[in-house]
């Protein structure tokens, strides 16, 4: 697909379903096939709200 060789810590087969280990503040992004900065999910105590702080998210309606 034209992507250059990835850094060693995140190299994986394009078809592999198991990413290699990322740093603690990172997670594996299958789209770019690399470790990237990752934000935490936040679960509000109350139900759906549209006044969350930036970078927060609701849990899915049908559950994880």
């Amino acid at each position: 697909m034209g992507a250059r060789r990835l850094r060693v810590r995140s190299q994986r087969s394009r078809d592999s379903s198991v990413p290699t280990q990322c740093n603690q503040t990172e997670c594996f992004d299958p789209l770019v096939r690399n470790c990237v900065s990752c934000e935490l999910f936040h679960t509000p105590d109350t139900g759906h709200t549209s006044s969350l702080e930036p970078g927060t998210a609701l849990q899915p309606q049908e559950g994880s």
Partner: antibody, heavy 125, light 107 residues
């Protein structure tokens, strides 16, 4: 506040070149992937290219491969799209966007959360 | 490449209506689907990511569901500011691809 500002669009003749810039503020581009997405007049969204600025890894849509080059300067917190051999069908508004990732069992659940205002590229003689 | 097929391409609805837009992927994309809203002359805005997660600041009348190949965006009670074009996008694999868009117009 997270912000992306594109610049560099304009009118260019077929076969010509343009360099688009995407200046980011409020976050560090090396932490995310940066994408270019375009929209031809009256048409839908088409992804063009992405880069992970932390290591320069890139990928391109087949329609621009070999003609466009995406790059980033982390010291300037800016991404670029060098467009060569431009064609009439490249006429579009070009947006840069940040892909945000949320951690789901150490795998990204992500999308393009912040977009620039867009810059118009017109390829015409 | 993974094709994303949206339906309908356009629809007419009234304020207060429940609106459902569907998106079908040409192959399994797990839950790696986002939904965006775009108004004329403006950049797209993220509504839903990972198929069913409501993005920060988005009103709760928007919801998303689905996994695998079939996905749905629902607006529970259409508001005047919701008249726009909506796009789905898969980010399961490169190239990330968008649906062709659904224009929601005033009836």
């Amino acid at each position: 506040e997270v912000q992306l500002v594109e610049s560099g669009g304009g009118l260019v003749q077929p076969g010509g070149s343009l360099r688009l810039s995407c200046a980011a503020s409020g976050f560090t581009i090396s932490s995310n992937s940066i994408h270019w997405v375009r929209q031809a007049p009256g048409k839908g969204l088409e992804w063009v290219a992405w880069i992970t600025p932390s290591d320069g890894n890139t990928d391109y849509a087949d329609s621009v491969k070999g003609r466009f080059t995406i790059s980033a300067d982390t010291s300037k917190n800016t991404a670029y799209l060098q467009m060569n051999s431009l064609r009439a069908e490249d006429t579009a508004v070009y947006y840069c966007a940040r892909r945000v990732c949320y951690d789901r069992a150490r795998v990204c659940a992500g999308a393009m959360d912040y977009w620039g205002q867009g810059t118009l590229v017109t390829v015409s003689s | 490449d993974i094709q994303m097929t949206q339906s309908p391409s356009s629809l007419s609805a009234s304020v207060g209506d429940r609106v459902t837009i569907t998106c079908r992927a040409s192959q399994d994309v797990s839950t790696a689907v986002a939904w965006y809203q775009q108004k004329p002359g403006k950049a797209p805005k993220l509504l839903i990511y990972s198929a069913s997660f409501l993005y920060s600041g988005v009103p709760s009348r928007f919801s998303g569901s689905g996994s695998g190949t079939d996905f749905t965006l629902t607006i529970s009670s259409l508001q005047p500011e919701d008249f726009a074009t909506y796009y789905c996008q898969q980010s399961y694999s490169t190239p990330p691809t968008f649906g062709q868009g659904t224009k929601v117009e005033i009836k």
